[in-house]
């Protein structure tokens, strides 16, 4: 089995985590990516994805989460904005490729989060102060919140994030042979 | 329709073990992870942990570790919970429950439960 | 591990009425992507329990609508708009931010 290989990233409360995970590959151009969190014994969990297919340069927020895929470069661009401690934790970025499972794309980030100094907020370099000027026309949950064979009523979730669910990505068919969980041995 | 169907009623002695049996159908069984859920009678539910069917990666709650063991098997679409080293105060129904996939973590469907008594 | 608190314990309803139960988590449930990792079930007498409300605030399919859930964060409710009589089981909240997942100890709910 492939020896899986973690970043370490060691921030405070309040900071941005700006990750950037290159594909390189161009047949991975426009395939829909995600950025999932890793529970304990390799459950990873969905929290956001780009479109599918995937827009060039074209970020979009989900809660505290931003994305942009930068297919020139060949890279997804992650950042998580104004981190709590609850945020830390291990994170990978994939590429869903149906009806193959997604491929990860290395390293994976491991995300210490800890207290901040009790200075001004957002005085430092690494801060979010500007991170919400990207327009609010990005902000979707473009990850369907919950793939069933039944219909599922959605509602955004009650936070200040304003995060809708296009009703395009509610009721998908065959979903779990599209976005089947990543395994890692 | 989605389903999952668990194996019958066991009584086991103290300090035997017990292996439960949980067969999905009605969806592709790889593709959504499987928790096990208890519930001593006339108590509130109590996780136990979870398995990923498609790998067999588990996580366990402490309270089990070392003895409690999920496995599947995925030519028969089936998950199985085994306890060691029972005592009485695992005497519990004990049910199998599959995890939406994707963005939420919730458990959409639960199987009909197994009585697990344990007695001298 | 998160600690869950549910109240109240029991409650005693009339049909036709509101109903309205309290569960708060020892941490924050919302997670970075703006959803809140609380879910709500209901186990009805000598049935294995059914989700009803999942990430806070989203009824589950074929949930009837007088049932909703709201909050952020670490506090939440879940409100029968007009409780019916197959409404009586035990609720449980059960927070999936992160393993082990857990639940609140539950509030029983009957026809007074």
């Known amino acids: 089995a492939t020896k899986l290989t973690e970043e370490k990233y060691e921030l405070k409360e309040g900071q941005t985590l700006d990750v950037k995970c290159d594909y390189t590959l161009e047949k991975f151009a426009s395939s829909q990516k995600a950025w999932q969190i890793i529970r304990d014994g390799e459950m990873p969990k969905t929290l956001a994805c780009t479109e599918r297919p995937s827009k060039n340069s074209h970020p979009v927020q989900v809660g505290r989460i931003i994305l942009e895929d930068y297919h020139d470069h060949g890279l997804l661009r992650v950042r998580m904005v104004n981190l709590q401690v609850e945020d830390s934790g291990l994170y990978q970025c994939v590429i869903y490729q149906p009806p193959k499972e997604p491929h990860m794309l290395f390293d994976r980030i491991r995300l210490v989060v800890t207290k901040g100094f009790s200075g001004t907020p957002g005085s430092n370099e690494n801060s979010t102060q500007n991170v919400y000027k990207i327009p609010p026309t990005t902000t979707k949950a473009l990850c369907p919140l919950y793939t069933s064979p039944r219909t599922v009523t959605q509602a955004p979730p009650k936070s200040t994030a304003d995060v809708s669910t296009p009703d395009s990505e509610i009721n998908l068919t065959n979903v779990t042979d599209i976005i089947r969980v990543p395994v890692f041995n | 329709q989605v389903q999952l169907v668990q194996s019958g009623a066991e009584v086991k002695k103290p300090g035997a073990s017990v292996k439960v049996s949980c067969k999905a159908s009605?969806?592709?069984?790889?593709?959504?992870?499987m928790h096990w859920v208890r519930q001593a009678p006339g108590q509130g539910l109590e996780w136990m942990g979870i398995i990923n069917p498609s790998g067999g990666s588990t996580s366990y709650a402490q309270k089990f570790q070392g003895r409690v063991t999920m496995t599947r098997d995925t030519s028969t679409s089936t998950v199985y919970m085994e306890l060691s080293s029972l005592r009485s105060e695992d005497t519990a129904v004990y049910y199998c429950a599959r995890e939406v996939s994707m963005t939420a973590a919730s458990l959409d469907v639960w199987g009909q439960g197994t009585m697990v008594t344990v007695s001298s | 591990d998160i600690v869950m608190t549910q109240s109240p314990l029991s409650l005693p309803v009339t049909p036709g009425e509101p109903a309205s139960i309290s569960c708060r988590s020892s941490?924050?449930?919302?997670?970075?992507?703006?959803?809140?990792?609380l879910d709500w079930y209901l186990q009805k007498p000598g049935q294995s329990p059914q989700l009803l409300i999942y990430?806070?605030?989203n009824r589950a399919s074929g949930v009837p609508d007088r049932f909703s859930g709201s909050g952020s964060g670490t506090d939440f409710t879940l409100k029968i708009s007009r409780v019916e009589a197959e409404d009586v089981g035990v609720y449980y909240c059960?927070?999936?931010?992160?393993?082990?997942?857990?639940f609140g100890g539950g509030t029983k709910v009957e026809i007074k």
């Open positions: 059960m927070q999936a931010r992160q393993t082990p997942f857990t």
């Open positions: 990430l806070g605030s």
């Open positions: 009605g969806y592709t069984f790889t593709s959504y992870y």
């Open positions: 941490q924050s449930l919302l997670h970075s992507n703006g959803y809140n990792y």
